[in-house]
């Protein structure tokens, strides 16, 4: 599932590049392992912002699929309460390219621990 998430992120990156969307998104670029689920939540919430702002059906479908995949992959620990983690709004705002790169990095963290 996580491998499919990465391929979806690559697809979103390609779609966004062709549309020239200029947005800044809350980005966790240095995820602590004890905050990875919280960070994943922030990434997914921001992805929905991309979907809504783009108004593009392909991006919408891909983001929706990515959320479905992430939910299923996290079904065992998605409701774990992590303490001492940053709120999404406390994160640094970065451009879409940097956001997606950081997203891939956190997904790889999940792959490495699964």
């Amino acid at each position: 599932n996580w491998v499919n998430v990465i391929s979806d992120l690559k697809k979103i990156e390609d779609l966004i590049q062709s549309m020239h969307i200029d947005a800044t998104l809350y980005t966790e670029s240095d995820v602590h392992p004890s905050c990875k689920v919280t960070a994943m939540k922030c990434f997914l919430l921001e992805l929905q912002v991309i979907s809504l702002e783009s108004g593009d059906a392909s991006i919408h479908d891909t983001v929706e699929n990515l959320i479905i995949l992430a939910n299923n992959s996290l079904s065992s620990n998605g409701n774990v309460t992590e303490s001492g983690c940053k709120e999404c709004e406390e994160l640094e705002e970065k451009n879409i390219k940097e956001f997606l790169q950081s997203f891939v990095h956190i997904v790889q963290m999940f792959i490495n621990t699964s």
Epitope: K41, Q48, L52, A57, N65, I67, N71, S75, G78, N79
Partner: antibody, heavy 122, light 112 residues
């Protein structure tokens, strides 16, 4: 008023195939994910398949995975369910349903068709 | 798979009286973004199912306000404040947080 008309049901032998159709009208079909849900005679509801708005993503339970294929033709406002290797336990009324977006709405099936009966028997 | 368990399976109610249906999931159905994709559907005799409630407590358009949904995590409830004759049918809870999406067994509401 949103309209969904399922068709294509009938009697088929075990191991056989059938293709169901669902004609959609009175809404922009390509803006919605769609699902199939079935109901065996006298039984409860069972989710069968879901397809994304553009048709790139499909989801199934293990009970039909590899045997059923959901697809859509947005130019014809039509949803399909190709059913292969049919079994007696696939006998049911099959409903098509429109799905609200997870991102903009509630990810619910807000409108349902009237259903078409599939009977698998020798 | 997430198992949805409803109770009671049969619910005889006097007209004008309240009714309550419980639905319990085998695990939390809160998704990663904090949403809970729990719906309630009504199926009147001989008819197709109809959406009543989505995301636990949101009433779908055209649904009378005597229907209400509540709950969180793994425990959910559908309440009808005053049962009317047209409410007869089977009520299903449904989770679509995790694939495969799953329905409860259904609760048959009938008039005493």
């Amino acid at each position: 008023e949103v309209r969904l008309m399922a068709s294509g049901g009938g009697l088929v032998q075990p191991g056989g195939s059938l293709r169901l159709s669902c004609a959609a009208s009175e809404f922009t079909f390509s803006n919605y994910a769609m699902s199939w849900v079935r109901q065996a005679p006298g039984k409860g509801l069972e989710w069968v398949a879901t397809i994304s708005r553009g048709g790139d993503y499909t989801y199934y339970p293990d009970s039909v995975k590899g045997r059923f294929t959901i697809s859509r033709d947005n130019s014809k406002n039509t949803l399909y369910l190709q059913m292969n290797s049919l079994r007696a336990e696939d006998t049911a009324v099959y409903y098509c349903a429109r799905r609200v977006s997870m991102i903009t709405g509630g990810w619910a099936m807000d409108y349902w068709g009237q259903g078409t009966l599939v009977t698998v028997s020798s | 798979d997430v198992v949805m368990t409803q109770s009671p399976l049969s619910l005889p109610v006097t007209l004008g009286q309240p009714a309550s249906i419980s639905c319990r999931s085998s695990q939390s159905i809160v998704d990663i973004t904090g949403n809970t994709y729990l719906e309630w559907y009504q199926q009147r005799p001989g008819q197709s199912p109809r959406l009543l409630i989505y995301k636990v407590f949101n009433r779908f358009s055209g649904v009378p306000d005597r229907f209400s949904g509540s709950g969180s995590g793994t425990d959910f409830t559908l309440k009808i404040s005053r049962v009317e004759a047209e409410d007869v049918g089977v009520y299903y809870c449904f989770q679509d947080t995790f694939v495969p999406y799953t329905f409860g067994q259904g609760t048959k509401l009938e008039i005493k």
